[in-house]
């Protein structure tokens, strides 16, 4: 959980499980106003380890739509457009927080949930196992 | 916001701003038990577009610690270990949800916030501008 001294100006919580249950304002504040996420939108196609984006939808989750990256190739794409199997395309994964409705279908009650998503792919050199 | 029909078994909300303010249980449910995120932990070093991970800490945010990837090179690393500037290392960015204490320092009141984080780097071919 999160332990920080209570401020006298804070909203009161009458929940007996406090501080495990908190109030969350869903009016999302977007900190990315100065950054345009579109600028990275074509990397999936231009990468030497290109990927496809698959839509994962779940109405019981917030956000309900998450995009999952799936690497297109096992190897990496060379300058001539062919796949080099001496290298490997691998997904870069990140653990993200989502809100899961609990109980199910309830509009105003959630539990925090951690899920692992693949954000994109990168090209790596394989680990060489030396035979003794 | 999130609009789903109310279920009679749901907790009641007396908040006048409902459904903008919801109850969230902070006992995180981790869906990643079968997946070991450690398996991708060395990609940052083995990638042709390697990256360093920088710790970003903010006690007013949940999670308070977020790791940001910074690409190590402007170009990409070739098989011989040298940097190739005909290709570029670029960050793969993802918008994630975090909880921001609001009002500040309050342990039980948050606002959802979207932030853009760099998760890792990928090697891309630059866009070729053809001259007419």
């Amino acid at each position: 959980g999160i332990a920080i001294p209570r401020n006298s100006g804070c909203p009161n919580s009458e929940d007996k499980n406090f501080p495990r249950t908190v109030m969350v304002n869903l009016n999302i504040h977007n900190r990315n106003t100065s950054t345009n996420p579109k600028r990275s939108s074509d990397y999936y196609n231009r990468s030497t380890s290109p990927w496809n984006l698959h839509r994962n939808e779940d109405p019981e989750r917030y956000p309900s739509v998450i995009w999952e990256a799936k690497c297109r190739h096992l190897g990496c794409v060379k300058a001539d457009g062919n796949v080099d199997y001496h290298m490997n395309s691998v997904p870069i994964q990140q653990e993200i927080l989502v809100l899961r409705r609990e109980p199910r279908h309830c509009p105003n009650s959630f539990r925090l949930e951690k899920i692992l998503v693949s954000v994109g792919c990168t090209c790596v050199t394989p680990i060489v196992h030396h035979v003794a | 916001g999130i609009a789903i029909p109310r279920n009679s078994g749901c907790p009641n909300s007396e908040d006048k701003n409902f459904p903008r303010t919801v109850m969230v249980n902070l006992n995180i449910h981790n869906r990643n038990t079968s997946t070991n995120p450690k398996r991708s932990s060395d990609y940052y070093n083995r990638s042709t577009s390697p990256w360093n991970l920088h710790r970003n800490e903010d006690p007013e945010r949940y999670p308070s610690v977020i790791w940001e990837a910074k690409c190590r090179h402007l170009g990409c690393v070739k098989a011989d270990g040298n940097v190739d500037y005909h290709m570029n290392s670029v960050p793969i960015q993802q918008e994630i949800l975090v909880l921001r204490r609001e009002p500040r320092h309050c342990p039980n009141s948050f606002r959802l916030e979207k932030i853009l984080v760099s998760v890792g780097c990928t090697c891309v071919t630059p866009i070729v501008h053809h001259v007419a």
Partner: antibody, heavy 121, light 111 residues
């Protein structure tokens, strides 16, 4: 002979904007990444930003990210640095310089004479 | 970011002296083939000028009394016989990682 000539410097108030230009001659401009390097009065050299051959990817030092934008126009052999939300700590001589080239040589081979940017109220 | 630490920060020398300046990187700036370390000279009111690239290669037009050596994290710039026009500030710079970084400079003054 390679020549890089900067212009656009001057006195600006904190929070203000300035656009620097760098005109190149004697060099195949499109064969180089280009960069801006600055030097605060009496201090050392500090890389600010670089832009690749194709002008589609640029890199910035952390302290200027979101405030400065590097761009280039190969048809005019000109490099630009748009500086917004200027701070007093941005006061420096700004040098235009060639960065990596198509042979993967990645040192700052050619430099302009510099243009002074003063941020003061 | 890779930190480059030059030593000494300043030195006094006479014409004809052999001068050595060192640059230590916080991590390796060398690949198996190259060292991504370069040296520049700057005179007051002037732009920097490239002297040595990739640790040991003399830039065209630079006098042969200048030489560079080193790999990994430790690099050296040597002036074999200091000339009057060599009194200036010298900077090392690495291009191995982003961001590009410079040493703090070494000022060579007349004794």
């Amino acid at each position: 002979e390679v020549q890089l000539v900067e212009s656009g410097g001057g006195l600006v108030k904190p929070g203000g904007s300035l656009r620097l230009s760098c005109a190149a001659s004697g060099v195949i401009f499109s064969d180089y990444y280009m960069a801006w390097v600055r030097q605060a009065p009496g201090k050392g050299l500090e890389w600010v930003a670089s832009i690749n051959f194709n002008a589609d990817i640029s890199y910035y030092r952390e302290s200027v990210k979101g405030r400065f934008t590097i761009s280039r126009d190969d048809s005019k052999n000109t490099l630009y640095l748009q500086m917004n939300s200027l701070k007093t700590e941005d006061t420096a001589v700004y040098y235009c310089t060639t960065d990596a080239n198509r042979q993967n040589y990645d040192w700052f081979a050619y430099w302009g004479q510099g243009t002074l940017v003063t941020v003061s109220s | 970011a890779i930190q480059l630490t030059q030593s000494p920060s300043s030195l006094s020398a006479s014409v004809g002296d052999r001068v050595t300046i060192t640059c230590k990187a916080s991590e390796s700036v060398s690949s198996s083939m190259y060292s991504y370390m370069h040296w520049y000279q700057q005179k007051p009111g002037k732009a920097p000028k490239l002297l040595i690239y990739r640790a040991s290669n003399l830039e065209s037009g630079v006098p042969s009394r200048f030489s560079g050596s080193g790999s990994g994290t430790d690099f050296t710039l040597t002036i074999s016989s200091l000339q009057p026009e060599d009194f200036a500030t010298y900077y090392c710079q690495q291009s191995w990682t982003a961001p590009r970084t410079f040493g703090q400079g070494t000022k060579v003054e007349i004794k």
